[in-house]
């Protein structure tokens, strides 16, 4: 095949090689960019910047090599459009630094930076950490900082991400209140900060105020939905990013719902309770306090992380006629109490009077005359026959 005269020539089925001296000063308009998985660039002294727009349209790119060129700056968002990038070789360029943001979000198996005049500073603390943790093949490169010695020996005591403190009101917050949160940011080289409020939705009206180093956030006219929702303050510097999440507890009174008993492997009287603080629960059976045992007890379902409502069952293991009756769930917190009741019938009373039977003596500890709905077990299925008579 005739040698390729162009600045960039196809290589394999989805690769491109650009090795003609000084032919490129940017990566715009590369041929067949959409399907490229491999891009190899060498000897491009005029290629000094790599920016977001340069790699737009290279969504399939896996391997990028830019070596022995004039690269001096890689933008923090340069690889935003190449999320599949797994190998990045930028060796023997003019790079003095590389932001942690550049590789954030990528799953790089290999990152090669040898042969660059790196300048040891906190901005390369992330790279030093990669070297310490054996990531991306970095340790094998024994990276040097220009005139400063090995990257591994760079002092890093002062290289920390920002420190955040979020102040939340310690007084009780009620529905309808306005709440002021303040995020204090400390640290060197602060670049950006803000609030993440994606979970809030309709929980409050949001107003942001202030800027570094003190960010304010007013949550106006809060609702009970604000409970369990994260309000997150974030800040970035050249070392990395820090986030702190807080939750605002909005007080509201207890509420309770009871549902008809259902038979599963065991019997369940389903309930839902809500309230902030979480209400205490108490069951009554036919008006008297129900002592929970391994045969009848409260079982909670796994709570959803972002809501206060709790769902569960009053679980009954193999209940009999003595468990038929009226079940009441009482829920209470400092802001109010609520109750709900339901009738449950698990099986027939085997001591029902039948003119043909001897008169039974019932030692049942509760009154079981009233049941609701159809009995679950028919009389001829019950394990209790009547054989005790008086007289």
């Amino acid at each position: 095949a005739a040698p390729c005269p162009d600045a960039c020539c196809p290589h394999g089925s989805s690769g491109l090689r650009c090795t003609r001296d000084g032919a490129l000063d940017s990566l715009h308009h590369l041929p067949g960019a959409e399907n490229l998985t491999e891009l190899y660039i060498e000897n491009q002294q005029h290629l000094q910047h790599l920016e977001l727009r340069d790699l737009r349209g290279l969504g399939e790119l896996r391997n990028l090599t830019i070596v022995k060129s004039g690269l001096r700056f890689v933008a923090p968002d340069a690889f935003h459009f190449t999320p599949r990038l797994s190998r990045l070789n930028l060796s023997f360029n003019a790079l003095e630094s590389l932001s942690w943001k550049t590789v954030q979000g990528l799953s790089l198996q290999e990152l090669v930076l040898s042969g660059n005049p790196l300048h040891c500073s906190c901005a390369l603390r992330w790279l030093q950490r990669w070297e310490e943790e054996g990531l991306g093949g970095v340790p094998e490169q024994k990276l040097q900082c220009h005139g400063q010695g090995p990257l591994a020996h760079m002092p890093n005591a002062s290289c920390g991400v920002p420190t955040l403190k979020v102040q939340v009101p310690n007084a009780s917050v009620d529905v309808g209140d306005d709440v002021l949160l303040r995020c204090q940011v400390e640290g060197r080289g602060l670049e950006q900060a803000g609030w993440i409020l994606t979970e809030l939705e309709q929980s409050a009206t949001v107003m942001k105020s202030g800027g570094l180093p003190s960010l304010g956030l007013t949550l106006a006219n809060v609702t009970s939905d604000l409970n369990r929702k994260n309000v997150t303050c974030w800040a970035e510097n050249d070392v990395g990013r820090a986030e702190v999440s807080v939750q605002v507890n909005v007080s509201f009174p207890a509420s309770v719902q009871l549902h008809t008993a259902v038979e599963m492997h065991h019997w369940c009287i389903p309930f839902s309770v809500d309230g902030q603080p979480a209400p205490s629960l108490r069951w009554l059976f036919n008006g008297s306090v129900l002592n929970e045992t391994s045969f009848i007890f409260t079982e909670f379902l796994e709570p959803a992380a972002n809501e206060t409502v709790r769902h569960g069952c009053l679980r009954l293991n193999q209940p009999t006629h003595v468990n038929n009756g009226n079940y009441t769930l009482l829920a209470a917190n400092p802001f109010g109490q609520a109750s709900a009741s339901i009738m449950a019938a698990f099986m027939d009373n085997p001591f029902e009077f039948n003119p043909e039977d001897p008169i039974p003596v019932s030692f049942s500890p509760v009154d079981t005359n009233s049941t609701s709905g159809d009995p679950v077990e028919k009389k001829d299925e019950t394990p209790f026959g009547v054989s005790v008579a008086v007289g």
Epitope: N291, E292, T293, S294, F295, I296, F297, T298, E299, R315, N317, Q318, T320, H321, V322, F351, S362, F363, S364, P365, E377, E381, P383, F384
Partner: antibody, heavy 115, light 108 residues
Framework: EVQLQESGPGLVKPSGTLSLTCAVS?????????WTWVRQPPGKGLEWIGE???????NYNPSLKSRVTISVDKSKNQFSLKLSSVTAADTAVYYC????????WGQGTLVTVSS | SSELTQDPAVSVALGQTVRITCQGL??????ASWYQQKPGQAPVLVIY???KRPSGIPDRFSGSSSGNTASLTITGAQAEDEADYYC???????????FGGGTKLTVL
């Protein structure tokens, strides 16, 4: 499959406190089950001591209630029995089991009360 | 009274049917469960609830109840069924558990 294993001293002095632990494996102590202690004096029948739920609910045999404490340690997936003021009548094989049906048992551990 | 009463000993010819009984007031209100115990071993659950058998328990074991009496029936007793059998149920108060005194079954 759930397995239970009792452990603790095999000899306790009269008036002392008997302490046993039951380690639960093959399942979580925080599941929808209660956990119980049963004892059996040599050559005699079974006696229920008490039960506990991971949320802290407890029930005890009325005849032992004043001397018994059952507790649960969710972090170690185990529950424990303490029986105070023991006498020779408390000499028995002590079993832990899963309530309410006692479908899984430990192998039992003999505790002798003697000076 | 929180008591369950069992016959101390029962015998059965190999292959025959035997009924072991348990009497108590609480059995009018609650199901009995039954446990088999062989010498030097922990008890094994054989019947619970409304005549339910755990997996691995042969179907020759069955449970029933009438009035204040619960029964464990072994239909076609085998040599390996020789053991002590204990009944248990909730006490009438429902707040604690009680065991019967046990029945020693001999298979002849």
């Amino acid at each position: 499959e759930v397995q239970l294993q009792e452990s603790g001293p095999g000899l306790v002095k009269p008036s002392g406190t008997l302490s046993l632990t039951c380690a639960v494996s093959g399942g979580s102590i925080s599941s929808s089950n209660w956990w119980t202690w049963v004892r059996q004096p040599p050559g005699k029948g079974l006696e229920w001591i008490g039960e506990i739920y991971h949320r802290g609910n407890r029930n005890y045999n009325p005849s032992l209630k004043s001397r018994v404490t059952i507790s649960v340690d969710k972090s170690k997936n185990q529950f424990s029995l303490k029986l105070s003021s023991v006498t020779a009548a408390d000499t028995a094989v002590y079993y832990c089991a899963r309530a309410p049906w006692f479908d899984y048992w430990g192998q039992g551990t003999l505790v002798t009360v003697s000076s | 009274s929180s008591e369950l009463t069992q016959d101390p000993a029962v015998s059965v010819a190999l292959g025959q049917t035997v009924r072991i009984t348990c009497q108590g007031l609480s059995l009018r209100s609650y199901y009995a469960s039954w446990y088999q115990q062989k010498p030097g071993q922990a008890p094994v659950l054989v019947i619970y609830g409304k005549n339910k058998r755990p997996s691995g328990i042969p179907d020759r074991f069955s449970g029933s109840s009438s009035g204040n009496t619960a029964s464990l029936t072994i239909t076609g007793a085998q040599a390996e069924d020789e053991a002590d059998y204990y009944c248990a149920s909730q006490a009438s108060s429902g707040n604690h558990l009680i065991f019967g005194g046990g029945t020693k079954l001999t298979v002849l």
